[in-house]
Amino acid sequence: IWELKKDVYVVELDWYPDAPGEMVVLTCDTPEEDGITWTLDQSSEVLGSGKTLTIQVKEFGDAGQYTCHKGGEVLSHSLLLLHKKEDGIWSTDILKDQKEPKNKTFLRCEAKNYSGRFTCWWLTTISTDLTFSVKSSRGSSDPQGVTCGAATLSAERVRGDNKEYEYSVECQEDSACPAAEESLPIEVMVDAVHKLKYENYTSSFFIRDIIKPDPPKNLQLKPLKNSRQVEVSWEYPDTWSTPHSYFSLTFCVQVQGKSKREKKDRVFTDKTSATVICRKNASISVRAQDRYYSSSWSEWASVPCS
Amino acid sequence: RNLPVATPDPGMFPCLHHSQNLLRAVSNMLQKARQTLEFYPCTSEEIDHEDITKDKTSTVEACLPLELTKNESCLNSRETSFITNGSCLASRKTSFMMALCLSSIYEDLKMYQVEFKTMNAKLLMDPKRQIFLDQNMLAVIDELMQALNFNSETVPQKSSLEEPDFYKTKIKLCILLHAFRIRAVTIDRVMSYLNAS
């Protein structure tokens, strides 16, 4: 058993049929010694008396808010949560496996630049009685500070018969140099509590590996005389690290119709302009990627050919 | 806007081409190592990230773009000083900071070159003959060093009398390649920045 936060405790249980469970001793936070009784949740049934209560925690029915009282007055609470371990593996029932970039990916994180600011998100089908708490650091043995905000519900989607909820959090490394060469990864830890179930999820990464620039901005077309060709130009996204001559991007320019199966024109360039062949009912799209360290491509920025 | 340097016309900066080749060569070599040593811990997640130049050179700090010198997090250690006769910029007005930056890059390359050559000598003794260093990568390191043209004491190639542990050598190769790739990215960024100055 360990303390998650004040008056909230996590009991770690090996979860299998007829498991013996864990013996837990609760102590009432009071100077009083006599006349103390214990109850669980909203029940008025007295579970025991005295300053300490010993319980055998085996299942979710044994978890919950234990309260010690004296003469009708509440003295203190202890909330017990369960953390299940099945076949030596901690449960991951609360969050959905996003399977990208590999199986057992519950947290996904991205950074728009090298400033040390990043966003992580996760998915769940649970809509109520759900709380998250996020901590982060650079390295684990001698951790350096990363400050994370509160996790918020950022999107809701319908997936077949189920509703899916996306939560996200923004974090900022306290003293980040955009030009630094990372040798210690960022660690992100998410505590998830659904009703009386506790789970924790972690992700470890270098900012350089989660870079995904914003799409290029200000796409413009200039038709070339006596030709089917069009000159398309664009600018670096505002959120990208500066100076751009140091943090350079490379670009992919594509002309394609509405369907992915349609024919297309595609060219890669380090410049902020390119010449492509425009077709009726097609769109010109441009996306960006770090020129020197191949992490993710940005989303496409698009303009119609006409 | 940038470091106070006089440079020739854009595209005339001779080290840019070499640094692009360097990044390409080390990336290819790392990819080859990851494929060949698939049953060894050779991915970014599996290895310890060590920097053999730590406390010996300070390339990131010495080569910091002017715009980032206002960022206190980028200025934690700028105490290294090097020989200042680099030729990459083909200009007499090369600033002191610039020379410091280019000589730091030169020292990095020299240290990695020695490590790689020592390691290759060990790998050539491996009866499995599983992996060797790409001669192209070694050649590209050499070309960039020549383009930088700094005079510096020759570092003797380390020779080891004990029987090499090939497993450890291959893991060390992975660690070295990962670190060198990250340094090659920094070098490429620096050269691109100087070329645009």
Partner: antibody
Framework: QVQLVQSGAEVKKPGSSVKVSCKAS????????LHWVRQAPGQGQEWMGW????????EYAPKFQGRVTITADESTSTAYMELSSLRSEDTAVYYC???????????WGQGTLVTVSS | DIVMTQSPLSLPVTPGEPASISCRAS??????LHWYQQKPGQAPRLLIY???QSISGVPSRFSGSGSGTDFTLTISSLQPEDFATYYC?????????FGQGTKVEIK
């Protein structure tokens, strides 16, 4: 199985014209760009131009501009390349090639040898 | 026009040995570079597109690398059926242009 089948070899006099055909099978004809590339004996390839069979748009290499005409007939899934004012240096194997991507070629015809000789 | 220069023009190789062919562009072409194999009397066959992207059905011993002006096609271990002429082609701008070819011959 996508295939491009070209017309047979031709012998032409200098100053005349040649029209080579390229019939496509497998896949929808208008879903691909169609190019013509030639290869003179012992030489490398030379790109001549492309056509978008969907709308008849064409683009030609400046070297052949004014001498080459690329057309397409959607009803027969056939593309044509006509080269006029032939000279001896036009002796080459002419290939048609196609792809959904405009700028490179994933399927080629078997080639048509055009010999220009007086 | 962008000029593509291949080297060497002829490459004698022992079967089972690796081979590398270089292609240089007269100006930077990013990764807009494709590789073809051609055997005598046959049409070219696409091997690699956009410098390093492999084609399904092409053996994994063929790999491409490079960007900017310098590109390499590598055959990790030459098989008898790999003896052929190899061409690079740039698609950075029109007109599309090819290298003059590298003939890989049996040593």
């Amino acid at each position: 199985q996508v295939q491009l089948v070209q017309s047979g070899a031709e012998v032409k006099k200098p100053g005349s014209s040649v029209k080579v055909s390229c019939k496509a099978s497998g896949g929808t004809f208008s879903d691909y760009y169609l190019h013509w590339v030639r290869q003179a004996p012992g030489q490398g390839q030379e790109w001549m131009g492309w056509i978008d069979p969907e709308n008849g748009d064409t683009e030609y290499a400046p070297k052949f501009q004014g001498r080459v005409t690329i057309t397409a007939d959607e009803s027969t899934s056939t593309a044509y390349m006509e080269l006029s004012s032939l000279r001896s240096e036009d002796t080459a194997v002419y290939y048609c090639a196609r792809n959904k991507e405009l700028r490179y070629f994933d399927v080629w015809g078997q080639g048509t040898l055009v010999t220009v000789s007086s | 026009d962008i000029v593509m220069t291949q080297s060497p023009l002829s490459l004698p190789v022992t079967p089972g040995e690796p081979a590398s062919i270089s292609c240089r562009a007269s100006q930077s072409i990013s990764i807009n570079l494709h590789w073809y194999q051609q055997k005598p009397g046959q049409a070219p066959r696409l091997l690699i597109y956009f410098a390093s992207q492999s084609i399904s059905g092409v053996p994994s011993r063929f790999s491409g690398s490079g960007s900017g002006t310098d590109f390499t096609l590598t055959i990790s271990s030459l098989q008898p059926e790999d003896f052929a002429t190899y061409y690079c082609q740039q698609s950075n701008s029109f007109p599309l242009t090819f290298g003059q070819g590298t003939k890989v011959e049996i040593k």
